[in-house]
């Protein structure tokens, strides 16, 4: 507890002090006082630098004195032999004796009293920035007019802080400008603009005069601008040393003007204004900005449109453009969005064709569709080459996004028919010679495949069985072989409307319009043993002349057997209709005159006994295409005949092409269209 006075005596005083002793006293007087310590008696063994025995006086870390020997007062009116005056309120006294004393020493007697100190004059560092006022036990600071005492109660400054500027334009100057600014002041000014505007400060060099920097380059008085985490300055000197236009990139700016006690100059004056926050003109590849400007600022909106072949993908959805807004923080919205090359994705598969994997599926990539040759060809042209277009579709120059259509090649047998050894009016044949040949098992008959979904046959073949079982692709129609061949399932039978349906078909004498179409449930896959025959064209090139040769094939009656197991074929010439009329009907069911002959019939045969017969009905009479010798077309269908091995009558297919096309068109699926 601090005291105002006290007494300190060496051990055993006034008797001799003992050897080997160390004792200390901590003196403390109240705050605001100094200590006056004085000795009235001093009798301590004398040694050089008081090395043996001593009394030591310490103030903080400083040794104020070290005493030994004998002292007497110089003043007859005062008992004081030694004294110390310290301007601090704490003091330590330490007494030490060594192991031996040659004489008897009585030690010391000392007293301390608290004394007033003049804080205003007693210290090197002046405690007050302006006026210092001493009183007993303390002091106080005071300020000149228009200054105020800071919270530290020592420093005076002018009241220049706390101003907040919110207007978009303004002027700020140091206190008293252009008169000298106050010393020892810290002036803080705040500029706070609405978000989206940056503070731009402009100064003129001549409007700035602040005490210059010291020799180390440190500003004694300084002006500093702080915008968020960016600092401009400190600035000082005669004439503004910084940029005359400071773009802070922030809507908040703190201006701090700090002055010391000396060297007042006229100060500074600045102007500020709020600029809409600029957003950088970013380099966004593969795109254009609309509107195009040299500078974009807060609230500006641009439409960024991707160049052709590029798109912006957001949430797995592609778009060709997006909007971006210059935000209050100087950054663009949607800045993560980028124009990237359009991806057309995996190309679609096509029936009876293929597409090679492209190196890439991105914009500009090229793919090529091909058909399964030689059985299919590309019907709708375009060459099969597609490129990845800007809209994300695979596009062909001719067809656009429409895919190529692979349709069966017609009328081309894999192996041409060659008449080998004669077998009673015909030759053995292979299905590869007549890949269009269809076998009907009930009734035993034939038909001709004309495309993936349609079989052409004679009306009399299907009039009694509207759900015929058909087979393709096999030379032999042995049951074991048929099991391995392709069975065709009918969906619907279309008999020509001109075909007269009879109660008793066996007595038929009128075979006019003996033609029918069978629509298949599933498409037929073409190959070396299954391939359609062409239909005749409608031009006069397809009008048959007498003597024109055609091929017939089937598993019908031969001279030896009622039914053939292996496919037979023959080449026969077209004959005048009268030749057929002249042949006597074998086993007639009516008068010879009752048999009807019409222009819808072709007469053929009569050579070397080659003819079609029972069981061949519905098969094609195949003639070489006059415009393409590599192809055969179905000129006729085996219909009827007066007598096997003579002349036969064939339905003239050319007369029914319109009906065939119309029927197929009206009963197709979207896949065929």
């Amino acid at each position: 507890e601090p005291t105002m006075y006290g007494e300190i005596l060496s051990p055993n005083y006034p008797q001799a002090y003992p050897s080997e002793v160390e004792k200390s006293w901590d003196i403390e007087v109240p705050e605001g006082y100094g200590i006056h310590l004085y000795f009235t008696h001093l009798d301590i063994e004398l040694s050089e630098n008081c090395a043996y025995d001593s009394v030591q006086i310490i103030s903080g870390d400083t040794e104020e004195g070290r005493l030994c020997g004998q002292r007497s007062s110089n003043n007859p009116h005062s008992p004081i032999v030694e004294e110390f005056q310290v301007p601090y309120n704490k003091l330590q006294v330490i007494f030490k004796s060594d192991f031996s004393n040659e004489e008897r020493f009585t030690g010391f007697a000392a007293y301390y009293v608290a004394t007033d100190i003049n804080e205003c004059t007693d210290f090197v560092d002046v405690p007050c920035s302006h006026f210092c006022n001493n009183f007993i036990g303390g002091y106080f600071c005071s300020c000149p007019p228009e200054y105020f005492l800071h919270d530290d109660m020592k420093n005076c400054g002018v009241n220049c802080s706390g101003d907040v500027f919110t207007a978009l334009i303004g002027e700020i100057a140091s206190p008293n400008y252009p008169k000298p600014y106050p010393e020892n002041s810290r002036c803080e000014y705040q500029i706070r603009l609405e978000k989206g505007f940056q503070v731009v400060v402009t100064l003129r060099r001549e409007d700035f005069d602040v005490e210059a920097a010291d020799s180390a380059g440190n500003c004694l008085d300084s002006l500093v601008f702080v915008a968020g985490d960016r600092q401009f300055g400190p600035y000082c000197g005669h004439g503004f040393p910084g940029p005359l236009n400071i773009e802070t990139k922030s809507n908040a700016l703190d201006i701090i003007f700090q002055t010391d006690l000396t060297g007042q100059k006229k100060g500074w004056k600045l102007r500020y204004h709020g600029d809409p926050m600029p957003c950088p003109k970013e380099d966004t590849p593969n795109s254009v900005w609309e509107p195009a400007k040299a500078k974009y600022v807060f609230r500006d909106v641009v439409q960024i449109t991707c160049l052709d072949g590029f798109e912006v993908v957001e949430g797995r959805v592609g778009a060709t453009s997006f909007y971006s807004t210059c935000q209050s923080n100087g950054k663009w919205s949607n800045s993560k969005l980028k124009c990237q090359p359009v991806d057309c994705g995996i190309p679609e598969s096509i029936e009876n064709g293929k597409v090679e994997d492209p190196e890439s599926t991105l914009f500009g990539s090229v793919i090529r569709y091909t058909c399964e040759e030689p059985y299919y060809y590309m019907e709708n042209g375009g060459g099969g080459e597609y490129h990845c277009a800007g809209n994300g579709s695979w596009v062909n120059e001719v067809l656009g996004p429409e895919l190529p259509k692979c349709v069966p090649v017609c009328g081309v047998p894999r192996e041409p028919f060659e008449e080998k050894q004669r077998i009673i009016g015909g030759s053995d044949a292979d299905i590869k010679n007549f890949p269009w040949q269809v076998f009907f098992d009930n009734p035993w008959a034939g038909g001709a495949l004309i495309n993936e979904y349609w079989v052409l046959t004679a009306a009399h073949v299907v009039e009694g069985n509207r759900e015929p079982t058909m087979y393709v692709g096999s030379t032999s129609v042995q049951t074991s072989r048929l099991a391995k061949s392709k069975m065709l399932t009918p969906e619907h039978v279309f008999i020509h409307p001109g075909w007269k349906l009879l109660e008793v078909p066996e007595g038929r004498t009128n075979f006019d319009n003996d033609i029918a179409l069978v629509r298949l449930k599933d498409p037929v896959k073409m190959g070396p043993t299954v391939s359609p025959i062409c239909l005749p064209g409608t031009s006069s090139d397809y009008n048959l002349m007498d003597g024109d040769l055609g091929l017939i094939s089937g598993w019908g009656r031969t001279e030896k057997r009622d039914r053939a197991v292996r496919l037979k074929a023959a080449r026969l010439p077209v004959a005048p209709l009268r030749k057929c009329k002249e042949v006597k009907v074998e086993k007639p069911t009516a008068d010879a005159e009752a048999y009807v002959f019409t222009p819808n019939m072709i007469c053929a045969g009569g050579e070397k006994g080659m003819d079609s017969c029972k069981g061949d009905s519905g098969g094609a009479f195949a003639v070489q295409d006059p415009n393409d010798k590599t192809k055969f077309y179905a000129a006729g269908l085996v219909s009827w005949g007066p007598q096997c091995g003579t002349y036969g009558l064939y339905t003239r297919v050319k007369n029914y092409v319109d009906w065939i096309m119309k029927t197929m068109q009206e009963n197709s699926t979207p896949r065929e269209d």
Epitope: D343, P347, E348, S349, K354, V355, D357, E372, R671
Partner: antibody, heavy 118, light 109 residues
Framework: EVMLVESGGGLVKPGGSLRLSCAAS????????MSWVRQAPGKGLEWVAT????????YELDSVDGRFTISRDNSKDTLYLQMNSLRAEDTALYYC???????????WGQGTLVTVSS | QIVLTQSPATLSLSPGERATLSCTAS???????LHWYQQKPGKAPKLWIY???NLASGVPSRFSGSGSGTDYTLTISSLQPEDFATYYC??????????FGQGTKLEIK
């Protein structure tokens, strides 16, 4: 006749791996893009992955990307799905399907069941 | 991704009645790339209608499909016993993922 037959499913612990196969027949396998689609018990269909006809381009569902890999061997007419780091939520019947016009899935296998459980 | 929402989740009708199944997309879908599948319990799905309105092979003509943009419909003019199944709509979009609706279960009332 087009046929797709999946195999390789079974019971596996979380974190484990499986390789599903899909054997194709009745069509020219190398001409068609193929997909895997799964169906969790009592739930709807979820597309998993697609591969182009030649096998150079693949797309996978985000939640399986990096864990599942679709591939094919056209010489063997077989489609594969390599499934690593399996999770309980991958439990499902996995179907392979052929992609036809406009990426419709015109033929599907009968499915193979994958159960992920500890 | 494009989300397909089918409604209703379950549709209870009697044979002979007309059924209308709806599929709504979260964003526009090309008509060419919207397909429908039929699935019966324990069986694999079957392509039923492709490109919005084209019937797959073997699908009876009582089925029809229509729609454009975000709204698509599968209609059965007169329900037959074999039509009771779950129907899924499905869309393809080049940026993926391919998505399916959650399904509509068509059950006998």
């Amino acid at each position: 006749e087009v046929m797709l037959v999946e195999s390789g499913g079974g019971l596996v612990k979380p974190g484990g791996s499986l390789r599903l196969s899909c054997a194709a027949s009745g069509f020219t396998f190398s001409n068609y893009a193929m997909s895997w689609v799964r169906q969790a018990p009592g739930k709807g269909l979820e597309w998993v992955a697609t591969i182009s006809s030649g096998g150079s381009h693949t797309y996978e569902l985000d939640s399986v990307d990096g864990r599942f890999t679709i591939s094919r061997d056209n010489s063997k007419d077989t489609l594969y799905l390599q499934m690593n780091s399996l999770r309980a939520e991958d439990t499902a019947l996995y179907y392979c399907a052929r992609l036809f016009t406009k990426h419709a899935m015109d033929y599907w296998g009968q499915g193979t069941l994958v159960t992920v459980s500890s | 991704q494009i989300v397909l929402t089918q409604s209703p989740a379950t549709l209870s009708l009697s044979p002979g009645e007309r059924a209308t199944l709806s599929c709504t997309a979260s964003s526009e879908v090309s008509e060419s790339y919207l397909h429908w599948y039929q699935q019966k319990p324990g069986k694999a799905p079957k392509l039923w209608i492709y490109s919005t309105s084209n019937l797959a092979s073997g699908v009876p003509s009582r089925f029809s499909g229509s729609g454009s943009g975000t709204d698509y419909t599968l209609t059965i003019s007169s329900l037959q016993p074999e039509d009771f199944a779950t129907y899924y709509c499905h869309q393809y979009y080049r940026l993926h993922p391919i998505t399916f609706g959650q399904g509509t279960k068509l059950e006998i009332k």
